[in-house]
Each structure stands twice: as structure tokens, then as C-alpha cells.
């Protein structure tokens, strides 16, 4: 059968019938009933939403819909011993504490099971001394307290503000600095933007309002008891000793007027310069310990959290394909919320459940794909992507010899601005064909496409006339099918303006604050911004699925190489007195992308010109183009990274959410200067920059004719 | 309409006990820092108790620790002053109040913008 | 006794201005927001500026506050009958752990 045969309608047809089926209207409707109660990993409600939804896809048409469990490692407050911090006089008297939970949004008092705000694994524990502000508990910021200040956070309790880096990092840096103890805070430098008022009457972050999340630095690992393997019922799972990627210090979050009063009484050295200081009223002295009258207080954590393996179900909805059924495209998205989930997840769930009922609503009419489309709906990932990851781990086999492609449906929107896309280069045309295709949302671009408004709020720092589109780095359910398995993935939302509001993420991220009402009220009154988002990932896994030839374009690999070549050679360049001496010499790799980009155009002129009703060369061309990511991936993975195998991007060593290119030349030559035995730190920048060159070759030559 | 109302006030002798009531409508109670005040015949006003919205944190004037507690029911939307050892320096107008937000800080470290009426406890043999 | 100082009396006749003085030390006023609270005879207290110069709606703005340091002041201009009353500051005491009251001035709209 021809493609058009199988689906019954020409694919234009068929694309436009799609996305003319998604409505505001219902992805408003479904984020509402998403976002009624808490729907934490391992509870009976999250249990309950994933029968609802696995229902519900049923009814929109799905061929199967399954539930998939796997018992993971999870972690929760002591319901009867709350975490807290204490500010103490030296009679060890609590003269301040932290608060137990935060006030709750008008209409919400009356909710149970509002779990009250924590950093996810922390251990327990009591640890009492003096304060050390540390900025971001960036890498950087380490540097300068340790290096310019000699200021030493060895046995010291460190205070963070939330932004710029994903916790985890924060927590790991100060666990390597010394520390016993990181209470992380959102300063309003950072999560309350001007000119909006607070939460209910804006979208600012309340002085009450914390940032839940996990500290974890899994890695890639999914469940800490069962690296590389799904955590099944007969599972071989470490002790919590050996468990993957657990912080040692307690940790707790807190809000800023918390942090004011920890932040008002600081001591010490001055901060080092303004990037240092936010905006609340307080010096903003890094410390150690208090001021004058206050130097004999100290600051007490009381953590008494738990871990435990807790059951957690993905759902897993299957539509298949006419044509090449054993072809897998996968749009996922978590379910699991820290509490309402208003914007993280729901807002992306509500617009993949009009993404189902869209497909649901086509099959229905006697249309198929021509791939197979798996949709799910993932648990567990604010705990470390551990549901994803886990499913991934059971199908590792299958995906790896299937898997075209992955779309990853998180929160449809950070902010109401401009479109923001991260994806794998061989993505680029796709995602610039599609927007092309669809009409934008934004004021003043009434009548133009999604293209023009997102160029122009967004433009390419390279190319003109062209948006920007990002590196995928980590922090959410496509690292497993990326960074581990080498499937092409993508991810698209709407976002802020980046150059005007410099908070990190969204104010009310992770907060009890984080309702429906948020996004009704202030984000997007009318769901256009979400029905944008649902028409371009609906779009690519409609394309990912239906197109005849896949519509990934390998020429843009090759322009990303060479630019992530220069960019590491300049890297290196900065000590040219190293490279000649250990004889450093970036020759190989610019060769072989050099190769790389030559066969890429060749093999897509052959790809443009070969007899596409050859249902063998279709295949076959199909394959080269699909395998092409996989052919990225080094099976030894990266140095201590074990599960970060894509040799070309991964998760900044630095920032989880970040994505780094070359990243195994780039940690190489991280602080080389500091380095005890510069000889042995520039013999590892030489053995990755052969591991990349050989990687970049071997990717190179399985786009080369076949014989 | 916001809304104060003490109750539980009364004569009662030195050395014993009474608990003040103070019933809250209007606003979200369980998002309020709340203060007892009080003000003895003819005297200026006096600063009693607070405690935090989520009960962490509860402070006393100098005068009373020890003897009197602040506690709350977000469920009752309802204040409590648990007042111990009553001694006739206790006697007084005790007045609930709602705890300020400004922005800046935490309300309990604010002052005042709403208050109850007022129940008269006096303690005399 | 209170550990923030007023005077016990001010007066002015009817449309003249009166200041009224606070003193208090850097634990409270020097390093928190000052209140002031009108308490009309018989009546309970009512919130007149927060946050040293705030004023909450329906105050009229005849009233206003001020601070410097460790001293604040509560200027009414424009003196009314209505206007006679107790006039309290107020601030939160970081080296008390408390919040304290002024002792309290009366204040006699004469004539």
C-alpha cells in the first residue's frame, strides 16, 4: 500500500483535519479537571488520574492504553515531625522558625494532602552552625567564595538562592565545598518580576510561597536502587548506601520572607559585588555567622523526611501504524504535580489529552498513521524523570531498534511571549516548516504565522531571518530517550521574554501557588497560547508519524558540528602553550566533520532523488535518517556519566538543565589550569577529542550509500 | 465584611485560669498572623502574644511568658489565649487583632490593621 | 514600661497642625516599620500608618508618618474634633522578640 492509501486522505488533509480538531476550549476543560486536587508521585490521587486518563484515551479511540508500574524510590515529609530551620540564642532557644507550609491560595484552604514544601531526598538530620550566603551555589560561585575570599563552608550551613542552575548542581557544589547543611530560598530578585502584584492578584511569588523540588544528581540514572535496570518486582536494588546520586547534607527550601529574617542578621565579609546581592532588605554579607549582637545565634535545620519505594504507574496509550507499525514516535508528558500542577505538568497534560482526542477523533473517521504513535502520560518525574526513565530501562531493546522519534509535552507555558523550542538539529526543518504553517497567537501578528512572530521575538543568534532554536540539556522525560538511548527529541513552549525578566523559571514554579487559576486569570485567559502549543507538538508527532520520508534534514547536524567544533577549539585555544606542549590538536575532529557534512549532502540529494514508491529504499533511506541520532551515541558513555552517552549533547556537569555540546572535551578541559597533573588533564582533553572524532565519523559513514 | 469577636472574658481569681476565644470572618484566616493586645483600666495599649499563621512561630511580651498561651483552629477559624496563674496586674480589655501585611515580611512582624472589641478579664479575690 | 517614648500631650485648635514624636532605639524602630494607632474614647485601637508612612484606605490624609533612624513622628495637619484621641506607635523589637507600644499620647483638639 502507498502511504496516501493507508491513511485514506492525502496527508496534506490529514495534518490539516488534525490540528482543525484541537480546541482552546478543551485543553482549558482538561487542565481544569487536572488540577482540582494534588496529584503527588506515589499517591492514591496521582493512582487514580492515571485510571482516569487511561479511561479516557480508550475513549478517544486509542488501540490499547495500558498502565505500567514500577516501584521506585520516593521521598515525603514525616506527616507528625515538619521540617524546619531555627534561628538559636545560645541557650539553644528557637528565637525564629521557618515556616511549616505555605499559606494556602483562597479557595484551596480546605484541601488535604497539600504536601508542604521540602527538597525531595533530603536525609534527615539536626545540623546546627553558622550561615555562609553562597549566591547561586554555582560552580563560579564556589570559586570566588574559595578561591578570592578564602572563605571556607567546611562544617557551615550554606544558604542559596533558587535561579540560573537546577538545584541538584547547587547541592552537590556545596556538599563538595564542606558544607553540612543547604537551605536554598527564592529571592525576589529572581521570582517576583516589577510592576506584578503577588499571587492571588498576579503571577509574582508570595513571600510564603516555597519551591518544592528534587536535589538528586541521578545523572540519567532513573530509580537510585536500580541504575539501568526498570525497577520491577524482581529488581536487584542497592542498599540506600549505594543508592545513585542521593545528597549527604540535609537540605530545605524556604521562601523570601524566611530568608529575610535568616539573610538580615549576616555578618562577615561584604558580598564580592552586585551580581551577588538581590532584592530583599538585607545586607547581603556572605558570612560566616551573624552580626555584632546576633554573632553568638546560630541557625539549626530540623529534617526528618523519608525515602521510600513507593509504586508509581506511567500510562502508556498505543496508536498504530498502517504502514510501518514496528516505527515508534512518542509524545510524553508527566502527570505527577508537587501539588495543583496548574502549569507543571497539566498545562502540558491538558494539551496532550487534545493531542489523543485529536488522533482519537481522526481514527475514528478510518484514518491511521503511517508509524506508530505512543503517547504517555509518565509518573515520578519531579522525583528524577524516574518514571520515564524506568519505562525506557523495560524497553530499552525495542526503542532502540524502533524509536524514530520523541516529543516531550512538560508545561505548555513558562510564559505568554514567544514560542521556545529545544530539539535535536535533525529537527530544525521540521520545526521551522511547521511553524511556517500555523498562524500565530501573539498581539500584533493577527494574520501572520507562528514563524514570523517567533523570529521576530526570538531571532537566531547566527542566522538571520531565522528563530532561535536550543540545545537540549536535561531536567525533564526526553533525557532517557536523548541522552541514553540517541532518539531525535524535541520539545516546544510558549515562554517568556528573556530579555525584560531576568527571574529564573516562572515565579510560582513548584509552589502551592501554582493553580489553574494562574493560568486562567493571568497567563493565557483565552487557552490560545496553549492551542499554539498543542497545534506545533501535535503537528511534529502528526509529521514524525505520517510523512513518507521522515522530515529530519542531516545537513543541519553538520552545520551544529562545526559550529560546536569552533566552539570548543576556541575553548582550548585559551591555553595555546598546553596545546603545543602536550601537542593538543583539534585537526582530527574538524576533518571529520568536515567528512560529516559531505556525505550529509550527499545522502540528501540522493534523499531527494530516490523512487519513493521503492518500498525497500524507502525503508532503507528511513533508517539512515532514523539510526543517525543512535549513531551519536558512545555505548561507554560519558566519564562518571555512565547513562549520558550522546557524544555530541549532554546535561551541563555544572547545570542539569543546560545542554552542553562536546561535553566530554568541554569537562575536560573545565578548570584544566587548576589541575594538579596538567599532563594527565591534557592526555583526557586528547582521548575525547578522539572519542568525539571517531564518534562524529562513524556517524558520518552510516550515512554513506550502502554499498 | 472583616469581623473580630472575643469571647471567654470574665471576673476570676488570682491564680487561676480562663482562655479567651476570638472568632475570625471575613478573610482566610489560615493565611493571618493574629496578636492579642491588651489595655488595664485608664493605662495605655499593651502588646500580649502572636503567633504565626502555621503556628511556627508564637511570641510573648515579657509579662506573660510562661503563664499565658496563643494558640489557633485554622479549621475553627478561632484565636485562643490560654491565660494560667491569673494574677490582678492581668486585668484588662484583651483585644484580638489581625496581623499587617506589608509586603516586606512575614505579617506577625507587622503590627496590627483589624481589631476585635475587646472582653474584659478581671482578676480579683 | 515601654521601651518606645511619647509625649503624654498635644493639643491645637481646630484646623492648626500637631506632631506627635516617638523614640525608640535601633532593635525597633531602627531596624523595623513603625505603625500608628488611633484609639478614640471607648473604642477599640484602629490602624492609622503602616509601614512608617503608609496609610490604610479610608485614613484621611491628614495624617501622616515619618521616620528617621531611631525616631519617627505621626504629623496630623489640619486639626479636627473628630481627631481627639490616644495616639500609639508601634514597631516589632528584634532584641525583645516582641512587638512594643508607645506609651501613648492624648491628643486635645482645644476650643
Known amino acids: 500500500k502507498s502511504s496516501s492509501e493507508a491513511t485514506n486522505i492525502t496527508p496534506k488533509h490529514n495534518m490539516k483535519a488534525f490540528l482543525d480538531e484541537l480546541k482552546a476550549e478543551n485543553i482549558k476543560k482538561f487542565l481544569h479537571n487536572f488540577t482540582q486536587i494534588p496529584h503527588l508521585a506515589g499517591t492514591e490521587q496521582n493512582f487514580q488520574l492515571a485510571k482516569q486518563i487511561q479511561s479516557q484515551w480508550k475513549e478517544f479511540g486509542l488501540d490499547s492504553v495500558e498502565l505500567t508500574h514500577y516501584d521506585v524510590l520516593l521521598s515525603y515529609p514525616n506527616k507528625t515531625h515538619p521540617n524546619y530551620i531555627s534561628i538559636i540564642n545560645e541557650d539553644g532557644n528557637e528565637i525564629f522558625n521557618t515556616s511549616l507550609f505555605e499559606p494556602p491560595p483562597a479557595g484551596y484552604e480546605n484541601v488535604s494532602d497539600i504536601v508542604p514544601p521540602f527538597s525531595a531526598f533530603s536525609p534527615q538530620g539536626m545540623p546546627e552552625g553558622d550561615l555562609v550566603y553562597v549566591n547561586y551555589a554555582r560552580t563560579e560561585d564556589f570559586f570566588k567564595l574559595e578561591r578570592d575570599m578564602k572563605i571556607n563552608c567546611s562544617g557551615k550551613i550554606v544558604i542559596a538562592r533558587y535561579g540560573k542552575v537546577f538545584r541538584g548542581n547547587k547541592v552537590k557544589n556545596a556538599q563538595l565545598a564542606g558544607a553540612t547543611g543547604v537551605i536554598l530560598y527564592s529571592d525576589p530578585d529572581d521570582y517576583f518580576a516589577p510592576g506584578v502584584k503577588s499571587y492571588p492578584d498576579g503571577w509574582n511569588l508570595p513571600g510564603g510561597g516555597v519551591q518544592r523540588g528534587n536535589i538528586l544528581n541521578l545523572n540519567g540514572a532513573g530509580d537510585p536502587l536500580t541504575p539501568g535496570y526498570p525497577a520491577n518486582e524482581y529488581a536487584y536494588r542497592r542498599g540506600m548506601a549505594e543508592a545513585v546520586g542521593l545528597p549527604s547534607i540535609p537540605v530545605h527550601p524556604i521562601g523570601y520572607y524566611d530568608a529575610q529574617k535568616l539573610l538580615e542578621k549576616m555578618g562577615g565579609s561584604a558580598s564580592p559585588d552586585s551580581s551577588w546581592r538581590g532584592s530583599l532588605k538585607v545586607p547581603y554579607n556572605v558570612g560566616p555567622g551573624f552580626t555584632g549582637n546576633f554573632s553568638t545565634q546560630k541557625v539549626k535545620m530540623h529534617i526528618h523526611s523519608t525515602s521510600e519505594v513507593t509504586r508509581i504507574y506511567n500510562v502508556i496509550g498505543t496508536l498504530r501504524g498502517a504502514v510501518e507499525p514496528d516505527r515508534y514516535v512518542i509524545l510524553g508528558g508527566h502527570r505527577d504535580s508537587w501539588v495543583f500542577g496548574g502549569i507543571d505538568p497539566q498545562s502540558g497534560a491538558a494539551v496532550v489529552h487534545e493531542i489523543v482526542r485529536s488522533f482519537g477523533m481522526l481514527k475514528k473517521e478510518g484514518w491511521r498513521p503511517r508509524r506508530t504513535i505512543l503517547f504517555a502520560s509518565w509518573d515520578a518525574e519531579e522525583f528524577g524523570l524516574l518514571g520515564s526513565t524506568e519505562w525506557a530501562e523495560e524497553n530499552s531493546r525495542l526503542l532502540q531498534e524502533r524509536g524514530v522519534a520523541y516529543i516531550n509535552a512538560d508545561s505548555s507555558i513558562e510564559g505568554n511571549y514567544t514560542l521556545r523550542v529545544d530539539c535535536t538539529p535533525l529537527m530544525y526543518s521540521l520545526v521551522y516548516n511547521l511553524t511556517k504553517e500555523l498562524e500565530s497567537p501573539d498581539e500584533g501578528f493577527e494574520g501572520k504565522s507562528l514563524y514570523e512572530s517567533w523570529t521576530k521575538k526570538s531571532p537566531s543568534p547566527e542566522f538571520s531571518g531565522m528563530p532561535r532554536i536550543s540545545k537540549l540539556g536535561s531536567g525533564n522525560d526526553f533525557e532517557v530517550f536523548f541522552q541514553r538511548l540517541g532518539i531525535a527529541s524535541g520539545r516546544a513552549r510558549y515562554t517568556k521574554n528573556w530579555e525584560t525578566n531576568k527571574f529564573s523559571s516562572y515565579p510560582l514554579y513548584h509552589s502551592v501557588y501554582e493553580t489553574y487559576e494562574l493560568v486562567e486569570k493571568f497567563y493565557d485567559p483565552m487557552f490560545k497560547y496553549h492551542l499554539t502549543v498543542a497545534q506545533v507538538r501535535g503537528g511534529m508527532v502528526f509529521e514524525l508519524a505520517n510523512s513518507v520520508v521522515l522530515p529530519f534534514d542531516c545537513r543541519d547536524y553538520a552545520v551544529v558540528l562545526r559550529k560546536y567544533a569552533d566552539k570548543i577549539y576556541n575553548i582550548s585555544m585559551k591555553h595555546p602553550q598546553e596545546m603545543k606542549t602536550y601537542s593538543v590538536s583539534f585537526d582530527s575532529l574538524f576533518s571529520a566533520v568536515k567528512n560529516f557534512t559531505e556525505i550529509a549532502s550527499k545522502f540528501s540529494e540522493r534523499l531527494r532523488d530516490f523512487d519513493k514508491s521503492n518500498p525497500i529504499l524507502l525503508r532503507m533511506m528511513n533508517d539512515q535518517l532514523m539510526f543517525l541520532e543512535r549513531a551519536f551515541i558512545d555505548p561507554l558513555g560519558l566519564p562518571d556519566r555512565p547513562f549520558y552517552r550522546h557524544v555530541i549533547y549532554a546535561p551541563s556537569s555544572h547545570n542539569k538543565y543546560a545542554g552542553e555540546s562536546f561535553p566530554g572535551i568541554y569537562d575536560a578541559l573545565f578548570d584544566i589550569e587548576s589541575k594538579v597533573d596538567p599532563s594527565q588533564a591534557w592526555g583526557e582533553v586528547k582521548r575525547q577529542i578522539s572519542i568525539a572524532t571517531f564518534t562524529v565519523q562513524a556517524a558520518a559513514e552510516t550515512l554513506s550509500e550502502v554499498a | 465584611e472583616v469581623q473580630l469577636v472575643e469571647s471567654g472574658g470574665g471576673v476570676v481569681q488570682p491564680g487561676r485560669s480562663l482562655r479567651l476565644s476570638c472568632a475570625a470572618s471575613?478573610?482566610?484566616?489560615?493565611?493571618?498572623?493574629m496578636h492579642w493586645v491588651r489595655q488595664a483600666p485608664g493605662k495605655g495599649l499593651e502588646w500580649v502574644a502572636v503567633v504565626s499563621f502555621d503556628e511556627s512561630n508564637k511570641y510573648y511580651a515579657d509579662s506573660v511568658k510562661g503563664r499565658f498561651t496563643i494558640s489557633r483552629d485554622n479549621s475553627k477559624n478561632t484565636l485562643y489565649l490560654q491565660m494560667n496563674s491569673l494574677r490582678a496586674e492581668d486585668t484588662a480589655v484583651y483585644y484580638c487583632a489581625r496581623a499587617l501585611r506589608d509586603g516586606n515580611n512575614w505579617d506577625y512582624f507587622n503590627g496590627m490593621d483589624v481589631w476585635g472589641q475587646g472582653t474584659t478579664v478581671t482578676v480579683s479575690s | 514600661q515601654s521601651v518606645l517614648t511619647q509625649p503624654p500631650s498635644a493639643s491645637g485648635t481646630p484646623g492648626q497642625g500637631v506632631t506627635i514624636s516617638c523614640s525608640g532605639s535601633?532593635?525597633?524602630?531602627?531596624?523595623?516599620?513603625v505603625n500608628w494607632f488611633q484609639q478614640l474614647p471607648g473604642t477599640a485601637p484602629k490602624l492609622l500608618i503602616y509601614?512608617?508612612?503608609q496609610r490604610p484606605s479610608g485614613v484621611p490624609d491628614r495624617f501622616s508618618g515619618s521616620k528617621s533612624g531611631t525616631s519617627a513622628s505621626l504629623a496630623i495637619s489640619g486639626l479636627q474634633s473628630e481627631d481627639e484621641a490616644d495616639y500609639y506607635c508601634?514597631?516589632?523589637?528584634?532584641?525583645?522578640?516582641?512587638?512594643?507600644f508607645g506609651t501613648g499620647t492624648k491628643v486635645t483638639v482645644l476650643g
Open positions: 508601634a514597631a516589632w523589637d528584634d532584641s525583645l522578640n516582641g512587638y512594643v
Open positions: 509601614s512608617d508612612n
Open positions: 535601633s532593635s525597633n524602630i531602627g531596624s523595623n516599620t
Open positions: 471575613g478573610f482566610t484566616f489560615i493565611t493571618y498572623g
